[in-house]
């Protein structure tokens, strides 16, 4: 059954909650595209993989990616 | 607690518009995308559309496509489904659910549902 | 496009475990979602992610996803159990995908 759609973007629901980053198994960072025209982040948690999408606007997100680039930059050589 | 009143049904003749709200509360409504749901007499369940949190993405499913517009107001927290160029097939309980708010979707909390019939 | 394959009704006595299969192409691949309705009710999310509960949802409700077929299974069989019940899947080319339903009749 083909599907009508404006738009391919993947979030259909966003999150505003903080994320612990040591729950964090992987973090997506999609950017605005022609197929998409919002940032899209979504998480993959440890916890049965599981994956949620958050919002990129939200303060306690921001902070998370502020963490996260934080730990990237520690270990990398 | 997640409350969806739902208002709009009713008897509508083969190539008329109907259009169906969803009035949400008890949860943050502009951060989760909705579904519409249908249900035909004795039938089962036929998913109808989706609309993203922010009203940007937009799925349908093929018997409806074209015909039907799925839209929201975050403002007023109401989700709406505008049904035009009815036919008889479209006769169902209608029903607005919230998604589940994870990937990938699902539907947690469901709407009373509304009775559509399109008769001559 | 992707299908959902329910057997249209499964029987089980009272207090005994009922089973309810949802057969679909590599479905251990997807999330499951199962859904109770009951006459005149609006549905009831009753098993997410293949295998997880909500908190107004008995112990006794559980869903497993493996190879072809996903499966819900309730425990200790009660009249009030007895519903239509309705896998669902997401798939990325036809959206929100439902099984045909399985009438359960506790015996």
């Known amino acids: 059954v083909p599907l009508s759609r404006t738009v391919r973007c993947t979030c259909i629901s966003i999150s505003n909650q903080p994320v612990n980053p040591r729950s964090l198994e992987k973090l997506e960072i999609i950017p605005a595209s022609q197929f998409c025209p919002r940032v899209e982040i979504i998480a993959t948690m440890k916890k049965k993989g599981e994956k949620r999408c958050l919002n990129p606007e939200s303060k306690a997100i921001k902070n998370l990616l502020k963490a996260v680039s934080k730990e990237r930059s520690k270990r990398s050589p | 607690q997640v409350q969806l009143v739902q208002s709009g049904g009713g008897v509508v003749q083969p190539g008329r518009s109907l259009r169906l709200s969803c009035a949400a509360s008890?949860?943050?409504?502009?951060?989760?995308?909705m579904h519409w749901v249908r249900q035909a007499p004795g039938k089962g369940l036929e998913w109808v559309a989706v609309i993203s949190y922010d009203g940007g993405t937009k799925y349908y499913a093929d018997s409806v496509k074209g015909r039907f517009t799925i839209s929201r107001d975050n403002s007023m927290k109401t989700l709406y489904l505008q049904m035009n160029s009815l036919r008889t097939e479209d006769t169902a309980v209608y029903y607005c659910?919230?998604?589940?708010?994870?990937?990938?979707?699902?539907?947690?909390?469901w709407g009373r549902g509304t009775m559509v019939t399109v008769s001559s | 496009s992707y299908e959902l394959t329910q057997p249209p009704s499964v029987s089980v006595a009272l207090g005994q475990t009922a089973t309810i299969t949802c057969g679909g192409s590599s479905i251990e691949s997807k999330s499951v979602h199962w859904y109770q309705e009951k006459p005149g009710q609006a549905p009831v999310l009753v098993i997410y992610k293949d295998s997880n509960r909500p908190s107004v949802i008995p112990e006794r409700f559980s869903g497993s996803n493996s190879g072809n077929t996903a499966t819900l299974t309730i425990g200790r069989a009660q009249a009030g159990d007895e519903a239509d019940y309705y896998c669902?899947?997401?798939?990325?080319?036809?959206?929100?995908?439902f099984g045909g339903g399985t009438k359960l009749t506790v015996l």
């Open positions: 669902q899947v997401w798939d990325s080319s036809t959206g929100v995908v």
């Open positions: 659910a919230k998604d589940l708010g994870d990937l990938p979707p699902g539907l947690d909390y």
């Open positions: 008890g949860f943050t409504f502009s951060t989760y995308g």
